[in-house]
Amino acid sequence: MMTGTIETTGNISAEKGGSIILQCHLSSTTAQVTQVNWEQQDQLLAICNADLGWHISPSFKDRVAPGPGLGLTLQSLTVNDTGEYFCIYHTYPDGTYTGRIFLEVLESSVAEHGARFQIP
């Protein structure tokens, strides 16, 4: 039985050219996290595997950095980065948990800084 829940940063916004941390946290389960996949819509961004460490998709290497922890840092943001991001936790023995984050990248310098994981 899957008892865990994924907590995410939810809906967040950031300024064009800036950086943001995408963060998910799995709680309420003793399942072992074997791998976390990060996806943007239909693109695999990065994978963090308990044995193999991080793999960043080559096409995102310049703008995506691993961490902190199982999170993902997006840099040099553009308006095209606006959209849904998913953290997919592969666990044993529970199975798969998925969290969703919506990022809005704003042209303006008055982007709301509501996310506690945001990089200034």
Epitope: T34, Q35, E39, D42, Q43, L44, I47, N49, D51, L52, H55, S57, S59, H90, Y92, P93
Partner: antibody, heavy 118, light 107 residues
């Protein structure tokens, strides 16, 4: 250099059993998921089974479920496929494969031929 | 199970030609799509993983694109050593499934 060397193939009668082995070297075997993929003569590739890095999780194609068992011994750097109740349609070259991040197959063995025939 | 449909099943081309092979999934597989090359009597070789990432050591004339359900493998300028059979494979969910293959032959 990564190497995967399969063994254990051969001729077996329908209903018989075989145990395939795959000896791995050149990498940290215990860190990688491993899979078996087969190819019938003149046909395409068919996934058979996979196992997680620590052996805790396994999965099978419907065509072999209940007949084949995948296992691994990380202390011996070896992957196994126990094949029971073999059928003519199991005749194929069986490849052992390394699967980083459980997403792509980056290394394949040379394959071992299993022939099921009376 | 996710079905992978590859087309064409075979094609004839000349050295220097641009070759395109397509692969369609029966449901969305995000970018969990890999491409392999196989020559007769040999094990398959990874070309492209995660839809568009070029495997280390593979010539840059090979490229992959697509996401969701539709994917493409392109060989920008076919070389003599590229005549082989190409397979797509999804790793979105088990059972992992392969396309039926595309045999690239010399015209």
């Amino acid at each position: 250099e990564v190497q995967l060397l399969e063994s254990g193939g051969g001729l077996v009668q329908p209903g018989g059993s075989l145990r395939l082995s795959c000896a791995a070297s050149g990498f940290t075997f215990s860190s990688y998921a491993m899979h078996w993929v087969r190819q019938a003569p003149g046909k395409g590739l068919e996934w058979v089974s996979g196992i997680s890095s620590n052996g805790g999780s396994t999965s099978y194609a419907d065509s072999v479920k209940g007949r084949f068992t995948i296992s691994r011994d990380n202390s011996k750097n070896t992957l196994y496929l126990q094949m029971n109740s073999l059928r003519a349609e199991d005749t194929a070259v069986y490849y052992c494969a390394r699967v980083p991040y459980s997403v792509w197959i980056d290394y394949w063995g040379q394959g071992t031929l299993v022939t099921v025939s009376s | 199970d996710i079905q992978m449909t590859q087309s064409p099943s075979s094609l004839s081309a000349s050295v220097g030609d641009r070759v395109t092979i397509t692969c369609r999934a029966s449901q969305s597989i995000s970018s969990y799509l890999n491409w392999y090359q196989q020559k007769p009597g040999k094990a398959p070789k990874l070309l492209i993983y995660a839809a568009s990432s070029l495997q280390s050591g593979v010539p840059s004339r090979f490229s992959g694109s697509g996401s969701g359900t539709d994917f493409t493998l392109t060989i920008s300028s076919l070389q003599p050593e590229d005549f082989a059979t190409y397979y797509c494979q999804q790793s979105y969910s088990t059972p992992l499934t392969f396309g039926g293959g595309t045999k690239v032959e010399i015209k």
